[in-house]
């Protein structure tokens, strides 16, 4: 079958790193500089991706594989194959159209990317709050109030600083 196919279509014999050159009677020609073909039987070579600006090169292009990019410090990858770089924010913040903004009270973000998410509602699981939430951390749920011995408090006293979730003025 392979032999039959190669007789019918000479391009099927062209290996990765080459293309089937219609201008030269369909012989296999090596990819020109800064282009690649990652599979055999290609009729063209693809231009290498260039990692410019906020992108930086993670893997150089070769004649058989495309370059791979990641993001410069302070940014992170989004999309398949790091098609976009998005600005990092601090923990306790989320990226908006106007830049990094602190999480609203009752929400948190423990990463430098993504959005602020609501604190866990411990009462939905019949539990009580063991540790208060902050902009950077979710609440910690403890045992249900019925499980606690009389007189014991489940909530740790708040830090002497500002109220959790509010940004300094």
């Amino acid at each position: 079958f392979e032999r039959t196919r190669s007789l019918q279509d000479p391009c099927s014999n062209c290996p990765a790193g080459t293309f089937c050159d219609n201008n030269r009677n369909q012989i296999c020609s090596p990819c020109p500089p800064n282009s690649f073909s990652s599979a055999g039987g290609q009729r063209t070579c693809d231009i290498c991706r260039q990692c410019k600006g906020v992108f930086r090169t993670r893997k150089e292009c070769s004649s058989t594989s495309n370059a791979e990019c990641d993001c410069t410090p302070g940014f992170h990858c989004l999309g398949a194959g790091c098609s976009m770089c998005e600005q990092d924010c601090k923990q306790g913040q989320e990226l908006t159209k106007k830049g990094c903004k602190d999480c609203c009270f009752g929400t948190f973000n423990d990463q430098k990317r993504g959005i602020c998410r609501p604190w866990t509602n411990c009462s939905l699981d019949g539990k009580s709050v063991l540790v208060n939430g902050t902009k950077e951390r979710d609440v910690v749920c403890g045992p249900s109030p019925a499980d606690l011995s009389p007189g014991a408090s489940s909530v740790t006293p708040p830090a002497p600083a500002r109220e959790p979730g509010h940004s300094p003025q």
């Epitope: 790193g17 990819c31 020109p32 500089p33 070769s62 004649s63 058989t64």
Partner: nanobody, 111 residues
Framework: AVQLVESGGGLVQPGGSLRLTCAAS????????MSWYRQAPGKRRDLVAW???????HYTDSAKGRFTISRDNTKKTTWLQMNSLKLEDTAVYYC?????WGQGTQVTVSS
């Protein structure tokens, strides 16, 4: 334009070796791929080996393990070392770079 001249062909017995040379004159760039092709009588011109623009050597199945391609950019020369030659390696061997081709050198493997 680039001119390419092949040499080193000849008559050799099966199992023997030959070293083909491709000398370039004119403006040839180190990033430009250099290739060796061969054409047996009545057959298509087939790629044998090439040094890609990223300077990595590649071989088609017929050449793997027996042939070695190398280049010296300062001397504008590319070589194809052919070992363990077989009867089916008989062909005219051409070197190519970009749109330029040499005139070919005959390799005959015969006992």
């Amino acid at each position: 334009a680039v001119q390419l001249v092949e040499s080193g062909g000849g008559l050799v017995q099966p199992g023997g070796s030959l070293r083909l040379t491709c000398a370039a004159s004119g403006d040839i760039f180190s990033s430009q791929p250099m290739s060796w092709y061969r054409q047996a009588p009545g057959k298509r011109r087939d790629l044998v080996a090439w040094i890609a623009w990223d300077n990595i050597a590649h071989y088609t199945d017929s050449a793997k393990g027996r042939f070695t391609i190398s280049r010296d950019n300062t001397k504008k020369t590319t070589w194809l070392q052919m070992n363990s030659l077989k009867l089916e390696d008989t062909a005219v061997y051409y070197c190519a770079s970009g749109d330029s081709w040499g005139q070919g050198t005959q390799v005959t493997v015969s006992s």
